[in-house]
């Protein structure tokens, strides 16, 4: 015969555990329900009735299957210098991230410990690996054939146009410059953009340092802002 | 509220060391990172580097990376300082500072610590 | 490093006038500027940042604005006790530097 599937709440079999979405309380001595994310328990069970949930009040959040007899509280509002990448709903905490052109050196549980300004590649040098949330931009000189002549955290090497006769030699900072005739083959004009990382949900993880044409010598363990300009000499 | 409290003043000799503490209170210390600033007599202020408490990370300014050790004890809420090979040009008031939010301008100091290096 | 240059070294106002001070980069800062004001045996204190939020509590006669390498701090109505030293800091990358500061007087 099949084994009967027991309601909540219930004794458990002596040695097994409850299953799934339920907990073991320990004053009724049963199996009793959980209570799903955006709610929490407002009655405990008895041996004859299950938990009683009810939903998170405004500000308040649960995010697992939970018996919490309170919802946790969200995040204080993100300052005017964050940017709300998730909301606080009854089902998940406020998360703030830095603000456009800058990332998250040093992260923390929910949101950024530490923002730095997203590394601008100089002239010579393209975007390798765009910046994103938590790491940084990853510049490479541009090789042979392509160019870039701005400092940015976004434009990467764009190939020298093509001249029927050059004036000037393109190099790694400067496209070539053709005679008056028109060149067989051109770029369109304005610089190729990378698009910016779009802010989802942040990343509880440590960026590392990437490596880099030349790397900043301003963090001595895992973290640290990044220098404004890559490859730049400063002042 | 939010409190720095550095240890008293120092006199010291060239070429000895010297150890600055700074004890929080009123936030949850290994959650904010401690700077370290430092300003010489009728001078302006110097950013030395900072420290994070919670996970060791550090961060020293390029001028003083080979004589500045940062530190903690979490257990007593305290951040150290200690600046190695003193000259008469360390002669400052050193000041432990924190920001609230993930962008450094100081909205907390300690009170600053007086070092006076002279022989 | 980054460099800032604040101008005038020092200023004598009248009680009332308006003082105004600037800070100039070295390079391109955005806008991550703060402005402290200090008194004598005391710490620093933030009076702005992010060039022109004010921190909290500070009197609204305290503005800044600027962005690029050009940043000005302005005292719309100078009061005796905004008599201090006033320092410029950027707070974009490492290292974070100050400006040299600026005394300000009552004339």
């Known amino acids: 015969l099949p084994a009967q599937v027991a309601f909540t709440p219930y004794a458990p079999e002596p040695g097994s555990t409850c299953r799934l979405r339920e907990y073991y309380d320990q004053t009724a001595q049963m199996c009793c329900s959980k209570c799903s994310p955006g709610q929490h328990a407002k009655v405990f069970c008895t041996k004859t009735s299950d938990t009683v949930c009810d939903s998170c009040e405004d500000s308040t959040y649960t995010q697992l299957w939970n018996w919490v007899p309170e919802c946790l509280s969200c995040g204080s509002r993100c300052s005017s210098d964050q940017v709300e990448t998730q909301a606080c709903t009854r089902e998940q905490n406020r998360i703030c991230t830095c603000r456009p052109g800058w990332y998250c050196a040093l992260s923390k549980q929910e949101g950024c410990r530490l923002c730095a300004p997203l590394r601008k590649c100089r002239p010579g040098f393209g975007v390798a690996r765009p910046g994103t949330e938590t790491s940084d931009v990853v510049c490479k000189p541009c090789a042979p054939g392509t160019f870039s002549n701005t400092t940015s955290s976004t434009d990467i090497c764009r190939p020298h146009q093509i001249c029927n006769v050059v004036a000037i030699p393109g190099n790694a900072s400067m496209d070539a410059v053709c005679t008056s005739t028109s060149p067989t083959r051109s770029m369109a004009p304005g610089a190729v953009h990378l698009p910016q990382p779009v802010s989802t949900r942040s990343q509880h993880t440590q960026p590392t340092p990437e490596p880099s044409t030349a790397p900043s010598t301003s963090f001595l363990l895992p973290m640290g802002p990044s220098p404004p300009a890559e490859g730049s000499t400063g002042d | 509220q939010v409190q720095l409290v550095q240890s008293g003043a120092e006199v010291k000799k060239p070429g000895a060391s010297v150890k600055v503490s700074c004890k929080a209170s009123?936030?949850?210390?290994?959650?904010?990172?401690i700077h370290w600033v430092r300003q010489a007599p009728g001078q302006g202020l110097e950013w030395m580097g900072w420290?994070?408490?919670?996970?060791?990370?550090?961060n020293y300014n390029e001028k003083f990376k080979d004589r500045v050790t940062m530190t903690r004890d979490t257990s007593i809420s305290t951040a150290y300082m200690e600046l190695s090979r003193l000259r008469s040009d360390d002669t400052a008031v050193y000041y432990c500072?924190?920001?609230?939010?993930?962008?450094?301008?100081?909205?907390?100091w300690g009170q600053g610590t007086t070092v006076t290096v002279s022989s | 490093d980054i460099v800032m240059t604040q101008s005038p070294d020092s200023l004598a106002v009248s009680l009332g006038e308006r003082a105004t001070i600037n800070c100039k980069a070295s390079?391109?800062?955005?806008?991550?500027v703060a402005w402290y004001q200090q008194k004598p045996g005391q710490p620093p204190k933030l009076l702005i940042y992010?060039?022109?939020t004010r921190h909290t509590g500070v009197p609204d006669r305290f503005s800044g604005s600027g962005s690029g390498t050009d940043f000005t701090l302005t005292i719309s109505s100078l009061q005796a006790e905004d008599v201090a030293v006033y320092y410029c800091?950027?707070?974009?990358?490492?290292?974070?530097?100050f400006g040299q500061g600026t005394k300000l007087e009552i004339k």
């Open positions: 500072a924190r920001h609230e939010g993930p962008y450094v301008y100081f909205d907390y």
């Open positions: 009123g936030y949850t210390f290994t959650e904010s990172i």
């Open positions: 420290f994070y408490p919670g996970s060791d990370n550090i």
């Open positions: 390079q391109d800062v955005s806008t991550a």
């Open positions: 992010w060039t022109s």
């Open positions: 800091q950027h707070h974009y990358s490492t290292p974070y530097t």
